[in-house]
């Protein structure tokens, strides 16, 4: 297993609709054809997997149907979008990149993007 540098923004504020997008960029030492991207969330000392996708270079990322993540790739960059976020989902979202094929296997883990989520203010009741 060889180490690889992964860069991601330090801080992002999700939209009022609970959507946060950020780029995860990795310094690929070689010509990988198969890449696996995993998003981890760290909050209150616990790390949980948010979503993961394996893709072939030049192809779209495919997350599971029920995943809250979507993404696109371009060269050594992965543009990740996480949807359905609420204030309680605020936390440090860490991008993990693995170059699966061809060998050698490379692993890179970013420093994390602190995603802040603000629940929208409830609309005042209106009488009609």
């Amino acid at each position: 297993c060889k180490a690889m540098h992964v860069a991601q923004p330090a801080v992002v504020l999700a939209s009022s609709r609970g959507i946060a997008s950020f780029v995860c960029e990795y310094a690929s030492p070689g010509k990988a054809t198969e890449v696996r991207v995993t998003v981890l969330r760290q909050a209150d000392s616990q790390v949980t997997e948010v979503c993961a996708a394996t893709y072939m270079m030049g192809n779209e990322l495919t997350f599971l149907d029920d995943s809250i993540c979507t993404g696109t790739s371009s060269g050594n960059q992965v543009n990740l979008t996480i949807q359905g976020l609420r204030a309680m989902d605020t936390g440090l979202y860490i991008c993990k990149v693995e170059l699966m094929y061809p060998p050698p296997y490379y692993l890179g883990i970013g420093n994390g993007t602190q995603i802040y989520v603000i629940d929208p203010e409830p609309c005042p009741d209106s009488d009609f």
């Epitope: 923004p9 992002v12 504020l13 209150d44 440090l92 602190q114």
Partner: antibody
Framework: QVQLVQSGAEVKKPGASVKVSCKAS????????ISWVRQAPGQGLEWMGW????????NYAQKLQGRVTMTTDTSTSTAYMELRSLRSDDTAVYYC???????????WGQGTKVTVSS | EIVLTQSPGTLSLSPGERATLSCRAS???????LAWYQQKPGQAPRLLIY???SRATGIPDRFSGSGSGTDFTLTISRLEPEDFAVYYC?????????FGPGTKVDIK
């Protein structure tokens, strides 16, 4: 080195607007957020809101909602805070600070004194 | 919104003494994202402690932070003349970010 440099002092009349700038240098501007904090004479620190330089999304303190607008110009690595309908109790020193996520507000501007007086 | 309460309001001590400042949150601070800042007259605040207990770059080791959840403490083990200032706690675990009212440490 990493620093935030703010615009100079302002004197405004009640009802007017003020726009304070905060120029960042020494780091990748879009990777972080910029928060604005003010301090009235002899008082504590009051958080006003913040902007994510990465995507331009904003979150304002409830009491200032509708009067404050925070923006960024990524081409010049500058953040702006505009406060409208100024009142005498808006007289304060206004600070910008870099938000780093886990590492808090690590870098602060030198402050901009705004005086609202008729 | 999380409300922070600091105590005492003023702490009168002599150089060389130990200072213990308290900060209490109205609800648990996410990931213990609590910071302490020092402010001297006419100056911008300076970050001392982040993540409740980690010292910021260049901060002397006489400053230490502790606590978790809703109760946090800043300790200055031996006060130096330059430590007399106002100290603010701040939570940045969830937005809106909030500051405590401050504790003034002055010379007895």
């Amino acid at each position: 080195q990493v620093q935030l440099v703010q615009s100079g002092a302002e004197v405004k009349k009640p009802g007017a607007s003020v726009k304070v700038s905060c120029k960042a240098s020494g780091y990748t501007f879009t990777s972080y957020g910029i928060s604005w904090v003010r301090q009235a004479p002899g008082q504590g620190l009051e958080w006003m809101g913040w902007i994510s330089a990465y995507n331009g999304n904003t979150n304002y303190a409830q009491k200032l909602q509708g009067r404050v607008t925070m923006t960024t110009d990524t081409s010049t690595s500058t953040a702006y805070m505009e406060l409208r309908s100024l009142r005498s109790d808006d007289t304060a020193v206004y600070y910008c600070a870099r938000i780093t996520g886990p590492y808090a507000f690590d870098i602060w501007g030198q402050g901009t004194k705004v005086t609202v007086s008729s | 919104e999380i409300v922070l309460t600091q105590s005492p309001g003023t702490l009168s001590l002599s150089p060389g003494e130990r200072a213990t400042l308290s900060c209490r949150a109205s609800q648990s601070v996410s990931s213990n994202y609590l910071a302490w800042y020092q402010q001297k007259p006419g100056q911008a605040p300076r970050l001392l402690i982040y993540g409740a207990s980690s010292r910021a770059t260049g901060i002397p080791d006489r400053f230490s932070g502790s606590g978790s959840g809703t109760d946090f403490t800043l300790t200055i083990s031996r006060l130096e003349p330059e430590d007399f200032a106002v100290y603010y706690c701040q939570q940045y675990g969830s937005s809106p970010f909030t500051f405590g009212p401050g504790t003034k440490v002055d010379i007895k």
